[in-house]
């Protein structure tokens, strides 16, 4: 954990953003020539990402520590947060430039304009998250992470506008999980499925994570979840923690929060 610009940071990063994703050969890392990298992307219905597309993805949290081919024979990789083992301590696109030898072997950065996007890093004061394809049914085998990161001192008010996920007793198939932290390890609030609208949730700090997962079968209508930034309140007007959870929702697995 650390502070930068009044915002919490840690090392949870997106594997896909703004239509851009990383691919390597079946046999492992750094095995693709430029022509093969191009073929990999085209077989999946996309093409090699341009430098601009990779940078746009990086800006919303796309971070991969592996050099890959881009359009026009360029090689590089996107770094969101500098680290000792990757990116030479820099952020941005670590750019190896346009390669003269197109037979060099790297990974690939693909761009697929048709991909149903989900997830991202959000710093706006308000936003609505939708399941991929909403209002149409979401697809199988989806994993999406929405990381909310507001100004230090602000809190997050989360409300469920629409909610319809495959229902099962333990929410083991399709579910939304909420975390009162910037990752999906700490601060577990709850896991939700079914079609009952969960109660509003208010964070304890300036960060929150939503995770959506769907399994390999049975889909449903999906969801819309809204958040709004709550500005800090003065100490004199602060009461007890206003974080709420629903005791009435049978499709809710309670986390560490007390029920109010």
């Amino acid at each position: 954990w650390g502070f930068k610009d009044g915002i919490f940071h840690n090392s949870i990063w997106l594997e896909r953003a703004a239509g851009v994703y990383h691919r390597e050969a079946r046999s492992g890392k750094y095995k693709l020539t430029y022509a093969e990298a191009k073929a990999v992307c085209e077989f999946e219905g996309g093409h090699l990402a341009t430098y601009k597309q990779l940078e746009a993805a990086r800006k919303i949290g796309f971070h991969v520590c592996a050099a890959g081919w881009m359009a026009k024979g360029r090689v590089g990789y996107p770094i969101v947060k500098p680290g000792p083992n990757c990116g030479f301590g820099k952020t941005g696109i670590i750019d190896y430039g346009i390669r003269l030898n197109r037979s060099e072997r790297w990974d690939a950065y693909c761009y697929n304009p048709h991909a149903k996007e989900c997830g991202g890093v959000f710093t706006d004061p308000k936003q609505i998250f939708k399941s991929p394809g909403f209002p149409n049914e979401y697809e199988d085998n989806q994993i999406c992470y929405w990381h909310i990161r507001l100004k230090y001192g602000q809190r997050i008010h989360l409300s469920f506008l629409d909610f319809d996920l495959e229902d099962d007793p333990g929410c083991l198939a399709d579910y939304v999980e909420i975390y009162d932290s910037y990752d999906d390890v700490h601060g577990f609030v709850g896991r939700y499925c079914g079609d009952e609208l969960p109660d509003d949730i208010i964070s304890t700090g300036n960060v929150m994570t939503l995770k959506f997962l769907s399994d390999a079968s049975v889909t449903a209508g999906g969801f819309q979840i809204k958040y709004v930034a709550m500005d800090p309140v003065s100490k004199s007007s602060q009461g007890k923690n206003t974080s709420t959870t629903s005791t009435g929702n049978k499709n809710f697995l309670a986390g560490r929060f007390s029920h109010l």
Partner: antibody
């Protein structure tokens, strides 16, 4: 165990359309790609195209672009191929074959084949 | 289109004999794969990624090659090896098969 069960033999008239199906079992349907391969009597194998069930994206060999339409139904784990405007040259055995999504591709499991006979 | 040329088209071998068939590609590929097909049955994956034997394939089979030239070898021919063998490339669109080498028993 992995199985690809194809629909039964078809007899169709020239100009008609036919839909062949391939039901997958024993693995997660959406994590692999499904390809279709044609084999005319006493001849070699010819790749038709593939579908990525997770996204629905499909692509056919240019030669089959106006002939074959590939679809996948995730709820029934079934891939299908519709062949249109049938001619005698479409008489063949058609196989579905699974490939990994990892490049470069190869087919690790095949269906038993569907025999299509086009005859007036 | 990456055309795969297999040779010979037909060959016969006596039991115990060493057998080699080749596959040449018009464009370089990183791996070649091989399928075995016996009459009236579906093809079976036989060798993948140039030299890896598929599950259940006897150890007398081997594959080698790189770039544009690949081969399948049987160290000691057996009666059950009678079949047609197809090479296949999955690197370039469109995916392509060779025309096959038919292996018979002498």
């Amino acid at each position: 165990q992995v199985q690809l069960q194809q629909s039964g033999a078809e007899l169709a008239k020239p100009g008609a359309s036919v839909r062949l199906s391939c039901q997958a079992s024993g693995y997660t349907f959406t994590t692999y790609w499904m390809h279709w391969v044609k084999q005319r009597p006493r001849q070699g194998l010819e790749w038709i195209g593939y579908i990525i069930p997770s996204s629905g994206y499909s692509k056919c060999h240019q030669k089959f672009k106006d002939k074959a339409t590939l679809t996948a139904d995730k709820s029934s784990n079934t891939a299908s191929m519709q062949l249109s405007s049938l001619t005698y040259e479409d008489s063949a055995v058609y196989y579905c074959a699974r490939s990994t999504s990892g490049y470069p591709y190869y087919f690790d499991y095949w269906g038993q084949g569907t025999t299509l006979t086009v005859s007036s | 289109e990456n055309v795969l040329t297999q040779s010979p088209a037909i060959m016969s071998a006596s039991p115990g004999e060493k057998v080699t068939m080749t596959c040449s590609a018009t464009s370089s590929v990183s791996y070649m794969h091989w399928y075995q097909q016996k009459s009236s049955t579906s093809p079976k994956l036989w060798i993948y990624d140039t030299s890896k034997l598929a599950s259940g394939v006897p150890g007398r089979f081997s594959g080698s090659g790189s770039g544009n030239s690949y081969s399948l070898t049987i160290s000691s021919m057996e009666a059950e090896d009678v079949a047609t063998y197809y090479c296949f490339q999955g690197s370039w669109y469109p995916l392509t098969f060779g025309a096959g080498t038919k292996l018979e028993l002498k």
